[in-house]
Interface confidence: medium
């Protein structure tokens, strides 16, 4: 629980690794500058939204490795008694909208399965990821626009749902879960785009950035 020092450190998302890297780079460049965290977070979030799949890739790899570490450590972790209660999840809550990548996958998964019937689920997922990464951003736009519209609808629905209120016993847990969920949406709502060029002072200049409209 909260005070259990033996509990494995929680797994970090790709975005969290990106922010950590941003902070470290900022510290290196401006060691004496004090950071306005809300402004910094906003900048990070905006930059993340415009990063290409390749740029995001290294952070996703870090997140994968951290997830593996977390799962490994959790296998041997024994929580203290009374620590196994699950957070309540209201089945009536609006479903989180699919991302542009998810919509893309829904369209292309059957095609891949049709062309390669023997592929494992993992290999199909890998192929879909590669296809998405190699899709120019202008070709991603139909999925992005549809995802944006679904997200808009979801935000209206979730606001209405919250206004109605939740079952009393569950209120506390759900609000907390949704708060962190909302933050994640803000950070990761836009899918990777293959369109932003890096400035000279940024790292990994050899990374493919190419354009094809945002």
């Amino acid at each position: 629980g909260k005070g259990d020092p033996k509990k494995p450190r929680g797994k970090m998302s790709s975005y969290a690794f990106f922010v950590q890297t941003c902070r470290e780079e900022h510290k290196k460049k401006h060691p004496d500058a004090s950071v306005n965290f809300s402004e910094f977070s906003k900048k990070c979030s905006e930059r993340w939204k415009t990063m290409s799949a390749k740029e995001k890739g290294k952070f996703e790899d870090m997140a994968k490795a951290d997830k593996a570490r977390y799962e490994r450590e959790m296998k041997t972790y024994i929580p203290p008694k009374g620590e196994t209660k699950k957070k309540f999840k209201d089945p009536n809550a609006p479903k989180r909208p699919p991302s542009a990548f998810f919509l893309f996958c829904s369209e292309y998964r059957p095609k891949i399965k049709g062309e390669h019937p023997g592929l494992s689920i993992g290999d199909v997922a890998k192929k879909l990821g590669e296809m998405w990464n190699n899709t120019a951003a202008d070709d991603k736009q139909p999925y992005e626009k549809k995802a944006a519209k679904l997200k808009e609808k979801y935000e209206k629905d979730i606001a209405a749902y919250r206004a109605k209120g939740k079952p009393d016993a569950a209120k506390k847990g759900v609000v907390k879960a949704e708060k962190s969920k909302k933050k994640k949406e803000e950070e990761e709502d836009e899918e990777d785009e293959e369109d932003e060029e890096e400035e000279e002072d940024e790292e990994d200049e050899e990374e493919e950035e190419d354009d094809d409209d945002e």
């Epitope: 900048k43 369109d195 060029e197 400035e199 000279e200 200049e205 493919e208 950035e209 190419d210 409209d213």
Partner: antibody, heavy 125, light 108 residues
Framework: AVQLVESGGGLVQPKESLKISCAAS????????MYWVRQAPGKGLEWVAR??????????YYADSVKGRFTISRDDSKSMVYLQMDNLKTEDTAMYYC????????????????WGQGVMVTVSS | YELIQPPSASVTLGNTVSITCSGD??????AYWYQQKPDKSIVRVIY???ERPSGISDRFSGSSSGTTATLTISDTQAEDEADYYC???????????FGGGTKLTVLG
């Protein structure tokens, strides 16, 4: 600061050839897809050609009006993009702009794009 | 694939004007707006339907609904007199498309 500077324009006769150039600076050129856009006198803007980056095999795309006559190319080592125009027609008379459509500035996407000042190509007998 | 814009629009100084751009692919594609001043310099004023690039006045705003994208300029100034072009990407051509342009006249 980002700069795109076109050169090589001039007056040519129909069916002749001309090569215009664009020198880029202030950004990582090899990461940027590049375009040529033109504007005939008193007319609107028209996309002419596009060249992608090395990881995209320098793929090229052309407007139907110039296909088979114009060739876009680039030299990443010199941060240059070129437009070779062959078998020129009077309707190719226009101001030709070199453009790099998008950038990220520092950590924040600014949504700014960059255009050169343009170079005039006149095709007349 | 075409993007249709009215050839001209006029507005009285200080008022609001909207310029439309119609295209079958706009429900699926983002619209971008460019301003070309009489000196022929070109600046993008809106990207991704409604995003404003840094350095562009907040008097410029964009929206998109169905097959129509709209550029709105509020509290119009004399310096806003220019040609405005919408553009959108189109995957089959692998080149974007420009609208025909709208000449905006600001009346004193």
């Amino acid at each position: 600061a980002v700069q795109l500077v076109e050169s090589g324009g001039g007056l040519v006769q129909p069916k002749e050839s001309l090569k215009i150039s664009c020198a880029a600076s202030g950004f990582t050129f090899s990461n940027a897809a590049m375009y040529w856009v033109r504007q005939a006198p008193g007319k609107g803007l028209e996309w002419v050609a596009r060249i992608r980056t090395k990881p995209n095999n320098y793929a090229t795309y052309y407007a139907d009006s110039v296909k088979g006559r114009f060739t876009i190319s680039r030299d990443d080592s010199k941060s240059m993009v070129y437009l070779q125009m062959d078998n020129l027609k009077t309707e190719d008379t226009a101001m030709y702009y070199c453009t790099a459509p998008r950038r990220t500035e520092g950590i924040v996407s600014s949504g700014v794009d960059y255009w050169g000042q343009g170079v005039m190509v006149t095709v007349s007998s | 694939y075409e993007l249709i814009q009215p050839p001209s629009a006029s507005v009285t100084l200080g008022n609001t004007v909207s310029i439309t751009c119609s295209g079958d692919e706009l429900p699926k594609r983002y619209a971008y707006w460019y301003q070309q001043k009489p000196d022929k310099s070109i600046v993008r004023v809106i990207y991704k339907d409604s995003e404003r690039p840094s350095g562009i006045s907040d008097r410029f705003s964009g929206s998109s609904s169905g097959t129509t994208a709209t550029l709105t300029i509020s509290d119009t100034q004399a310096e806003d007199e220019a040609d405005y072009y919408c553009h959108s990407t189109y995957s089959d051509d692998k080149l974007p498309v420009f609208g025909g342009g709208t000449k905006l006249t600001v009346l004193g």
